[in-house]
């Protein structure tokens, strides 16, 4: 297992939201991406394929999500002060073989200016 | 270690229906694509079909769309062939195979089906 | 659907040979960096059992003297010094599309 902080910008504001970006190498075809809060799974979303090349796709802790050929965002809505917390992607590797575990992470710091109903 | 064990295999006549299972143990069955491929007496190895983790995709080979159903208990670790109209060509060991994300890693012993009146 | 072909059907071989056998793709199996192209063995009365992934990855336990090779639509599996037990059928399989198609097979007898 490799651990490690993000080398990119994990957290991204809009709307009282925030997206948090989980990257993989391009070479990745199925894999296993977890989004954990502390030691607990928030949201997952693994990408698997069939002896047909079929991708599947599934959830098992639903949360918004969205796919790209490098990376998985996952997105969290109604950000109060509570979600300040380290995030880490925890990335297992099905394919191309060897399986691997990668987890990277960082610190989500909230500020008043990204709360989504602040009080005037 | 994993184990795939079919049983259901048999005489049937030409027309007719039957049902072929395949226990799974010694991995977590709901984390793979699992597969039915087929071997008729003295000839090579054909795709039957494949489902994925959770059922909700299945796909077929041309030879058994819309005759053949495949599907799965993941409570029971069970993968199911349903096969129905069945014709003499369909004569053959059935194998379950699981999709090991890039190839087919682990294979039952297999069962027989033979299509006869 | 992608066929797939295999030369020889069969062949008699003896121990401490060098077999090849060959496999050829009607379209070529290369996707990114991977050719999805696949070696199972079976012999006589038993399950077929992975050898190759990948075109030339071998699988855990799979002794050295299997080698598989080749990229786009040509393949070849080598057994380096054959040995008894290693006679049964070969065959090659694609995993590129819907259907996965296998080879005809390669059966190695003894000579």
């Known amino acids: 297992e490799i651990n490690g902080s993000a080398n990119y910008e994990m957290f991204i504001f809009h709307n009282g939201g925030v997206q948090i970006l989980c990257k993989y190498p391009d070479i990745v075809q199925q894999f296993k991406m977890q989004l954990l809060k502390g030691g607990q799974i928030l949201c997952d979303l693994t990408k698997t394929k069939g002896s047909g090349n079929t991708v599947s796709i599934k959830s098992l802790k639903f949360c918004h999500s969205q796919l790209s050929n490098n990376s998985v965002s996952f997105f969290l809505y109604n950000l109060d002060h509570s979600h300040a917390n380290y995030y880490f992607c925890n990335l297992s590797i099905f394919d191309p073989p060897p399986f691997k575990v990668t987890l990277t992470g960082g610190y989500l710091h909230i500020y008043e200016s990204q709360l989504c109903c602040q009080l005037k | 270690e994993v184990q795939l064990v079919e049983s259901g295999g048999g005489l049937v006549k030409p027309g007719g229906s039957l049902k072929l299972s395949c226990a799974a143990s010694g991995f977590t069955f709901s984390d793979y694509w699992m597969d039915w491929v087929r071997q008729a007496p003295g000839k090579g190895l054909e795709w039957v079909g494949n489902?994925?983790?959770?059922?909700?995709?299945?796909e077929y080979s041309p030879f058994v769309k819309g005759r053949f159903t495949i599907s799965r208990d993941n409570v029971k670790n069970t993968l199911y062939l349903q096969m129905n109209s069945v014709k003499s060509e369909d004569t053959a060991t059935y194998y379950c195979?699981?999709?090991?994300?890039?190839?087919?890693?682990?294979w039952g012993q297999g069962t027989l089906v033979t299509v006869s009146s | 659907d992608i066929v797939m072909t295999q030369s020889p059907s069969s062949l008699a071989v003896s121990a401490g040979d060098r077999v090849t056998i060959n496999c050829k793709s009607s379209?070529?199996?290369?996707?990114?960096?991977?050719?999805?192209l696949t070696w199972y063995q079976q012999k006589t009365g038993q399950a077929p059992k992975l050898l190759i992934f990948?075109?030339?990855t071998r699988h855990t336990g799979v002794p050295d003297r299997f080698m598989g090779s080749g990229s786009g639509t040509d393949f070849t599996l080598t057994i380096n010094s054959f040995q008894t037990e290693d006679l049964g059928d070969y065959y090659c399989h694609h995993h590129y599309n819907a259907p996965p198609t296998f080879g005809p097979g390669t059966k190695l007898e003894l000579r």
């Open positions: 379209q070529s199996l290369l996707s990114g960096s991977f050719n999805y």
């Open positions: 195979s699981r999709w090991g994300r890039f190839a087919f890693d682990s």
């Open positions: 990948y075109a030339s």
């Open positions: 489902i994925d983790e959770d059922g909700s995709i299945a």
